[in-house]
């Protein structure tokens, strides 16, 4: 186990022409924060793939307001290191993504808005315990200067943080078979303490508290033969010659989960699902009561007044697991309303809203009919982030404030002439046509097609359309 540490030295315009505009302004003050994502190995992975080695977010930097006319300087940075703890061995080779985010602090609806300013990525080799490595990366017109290192957490040491060290018991030398721990010469390599009861003949461990089985053996303590007696030797005959079942070297071999926990493989290691009353990486912590605070992330502990009675953690929204230790994939809850796009930044959710919606979760329908009047007797019609006014006759425009030209749409058929009238429009029909819109031909014998002309109105007379 150990910690990857990242120190940001500066973020500002890179050298050369085309200096970027300051991301902040007097109208929109803002501040920066950084996110680092680590992945094992040197593989080119999509930015969206999981940060399997871990991720971290910085604090927010000081609020910055651009000085009018001044070029964008190096922007004020958050204090402190970004630290990414790693639980297992340090892989030695890793990929990183460092993102620079801007938090706008203007008084816009929906509160502070986040936007990604720059993203840099790289692949590096790095031994744990070494000195700080310095780096400069460019993203567009921006330049990011930073240092990083990986360090082991005691008692782990070594370039991969896999060796364990303990203070010397005797002043002069280490115990039999144990070397001094460089660079900590006053400490000695500690023998690994496997899980209690782990078979000394058929089990071994690479980390304290585990019990991994040699081929042909299984069970939590590697005491159960997999198949027939022909498979019992520590390096038993191959399955091809004897028909023995030889388990593959998976991370769940020998079930590293104690106390009845069930093991499931993850891309890099394993994960234990613990029964009630137990928790920890391998379900090794037991006898827990609510007084021990076993519920993480604000979970509410119920029951478990004494070690013999089980406790239950009621998790707050966003967390799950028997101890509320697992963060829900928050975007899977589709928290962004009204078709908004969900972004899980780690420290917070961000919703990118469709046009017509705003707010942290796109819950604010900006274009609804509430409080919006359509003038001149128009009525408001709502619909999915947009509203429109259905205007009364003679009016038009977004809010029915414009007087419409009723003749603009050429409503009089068959060459009829249109006249605007205070109550609508009037069509003066061409010879041979009649009707409010001159839509009916007049038959040669003087009879008209339905509907009949009103009494006293000759074909060709202007007809008012009311």
């Amino acid at each position: 186990a150990g910690v990857f540490e990242l120190q940001i030295h500066s973020f500002g315009p890179g050298p050369g022409p085309g200096a970027p505009r300051s991301p902040c302004s007097a109208r929109l003050p803002c501040r920066l924060f950084f996110r680092v994502c680590l992945k094992p190995g040197l593989s080119e992975e999509a930015a969206e793939s999981p940060c399997a080695l871990g991720a971290a977010l910085s604090a927010r930097g000081p609020v910055y307001t651009e000085q009018p006319g001044a070029p964008a300087p190096d922007l004020p940075l958050p204090d402190g290191l970004l630290q990414v703890p790693f639980r297992d061995a340090w892989p030695g080779t890793f990929s990183f993504i460092i993102e620079t985010w801007r938090e706008e602090l203007g008084d816009q609806i929906g509160g502070p808005a986040w936007s990604l300013l720059a993203r840099v990525a790289g692949r590096r080799r790095l031994a744990a315990g070494g000195p700080w490595a310095r780096d400069i990366q460019r993203a567009g017109a921006w330049e990011l200067r930073f240092s990083y290192r990986a360090r082991c957490e005691p008692p782990a040491v070594g370039t991969a943080c896999t060796r364990l060290c303990r203070p010397r018991s005797a002043p002069s030398r280490c115990g039999p078979g144990l070397r001094p721990c460089a660079p900590l010469e006053d400490e000695c390599e500690a023998p690994l303490v496997c899980r209690a009861g782990c078979s000394p003949e058929h089990g071994f461990c690479e980390q304290p508290g585990e019990c991994r089985c040699l081929e042909g053996w299984t069970g939590p303590l590697c005491t159960v033969p997999v198949s027939t007696s022909s498979c019992l030797s520590p390096r038993g005959p191959s399955s091809a010659t004897t028909g023995c079942l030889v388990p593959g070297p998976g991370p769940c071999d020998g079930n590293p989960c104690a106390n009845g926990g069930s093991c499931s493989e993850t891309p890099r290691s394993f994960e234990c699902t613990c029964p009630r009353g137990f928790y920890g990486l391998r379900c090794e912590v037991s006898g827990v009561t609510c007084a021990d605070g076993p519920c993480f992330n604000g979970g509410l502990c119920v029951g478990g007044a004494d070690p013999d009675s089980a406790y239950i953690c009621h998790c707050p929204p966003g967390f799950q697991g028997s101890n509320c230790e697992k963060r829900v994939d928050r975007c899977s809850l589709q928290p962004c309303r009204n078709g908004g796009l969900c972004l899980d930044l780690g420290h917070a959710l961000r919703c990118r809203c469709r046009a017509g919606f705003a707010g942290p979760r796109c819950e604010h329908d900006l274009d609804d009919c509430a409080g919006r009047a359509c003038a001149n007797g128009g009525t408001c019609v709502e619909g999915g982030g947009a509203h429109r006014c259905s205007c009364a006759l003679g009016f038009g425009g977004r809010d029915c404030r414009e007087r419409a030209d009723p003749c603009a749409a050429r409503p009089c058929a068959h060459g009829g002439r249109c006249y605007a009238h205070f109550s609508g429009l009037v069509c003066a029909c061409a010879p041979g046509y009649m009707g409010a819109r001159c839509e009916f031909p007049v038959h040669p014998d003087g009879a008209s097609a339905l509907p009949a002309a009103p009494p006293g109105l000759r074909p060709g007379d202007p007809q008012r359309y009311l």
Partner: antibody, heavy 121, light 107 residues
């Protein structure tokens, strides 16, 4: 244990003002959005106003927009509702309620006992 | 605004009965539907959020279901402490709106 305690209610004349307070304890106040909800005598619940965890965002019901102002002081773990130009129809029990973490669901997961506001001449 | 219509407005039931309350939204609220219980003393408690998720400490006899515009709160076996008024609330689009309430009384 989450606790929300409202205060500041009372009798006020139409057109008058009142400031309600809500003291929060038992949780990290600055991590949660907060709501005011009211209930007129013999009626159902009506949402009044909301303020985000950092205080950047606030929303109001149309019936109180322009008259009421929601605010918070995270250092004091306190929520406030400044009510101006009060009307008879604002008479109600006013509840302070906590929003859910990160406002994913816009629930009101814990409520105070309420404070009574009576607007009458 | 999204209107929330609860039915029935009141019902009488006995201890042990299965009780169902429905809530209809005037438009799709994409499961952002919460249920609350209010006891006669005035105290309000969240029971269920996001249509079907039980809030901390709420007994499992309470359950919720639904999608789109139609949602249901079910009490599988009514207990004496369940006699109260129940409200639904949509958390999809501002302003947040509550149903008119359903009063569950002793038969």
């Amino acid at each position: 244990e989450v606790q929300l305690v409202e205060s500041g209610g009372g009798l006020v004349q139409p057109g008058g003002s009142l400031r309600l307070s809500c003291a929060a304890s038992g949780f990290t106040f600055s991590d949660y959005g907060m709501h005011w909800v009211r209930q007129a005598p013999g009626k159902g619940l009506e949402w009044v106003a909301y303020i985000s965890s950092g205080g950047y965002t606030s929303y109001y019901a149309d019936t109180v927009k322009g008259r009421f102002t929601i605010s918070r002081d995270n250092a004091k773990n306190s929520l406030y509702l400044q009510m101006n130009s009060l009307r008879a129809e604002d008479t109600a029990v006013y509840y302070c309620a906590r929003g859910d973490y990160e406002d994913i669901f816009y629930t009101m997961d814990y409520w105070g006992q309420g404070t009574t506001v009576t607007v009458s001449s | 605004d999204i209107q929330m219509t609860q039915s029935p407005s009141s019902l009488s039931a006995s201890v042990g009965d299965r009780v169902t309350i429905t809530c209809r939204a005037s438009r799709d609220i994409t499961k952002f539907l919460n249920w609350y219980q209010q006891k006669p003393g005035g105290a309000v408690k969240l029971l269920i959020y996001y249509t079907s998720r039980l809030h901390s400490g709420v007994p499992s006899r309470f359950s919720g279901s639904g999608s789109g515009t139609d949602y249901t709160l079910t009490i599988s076996s009514l207990q004496p402490e369940d006699f109260a008024t129940y409200y639904c609330q949509q958390g999809n689009t501002l302003p947040w709106t509550f149903g008119g309430g359903t009063k569950v009384e002793i038969k």
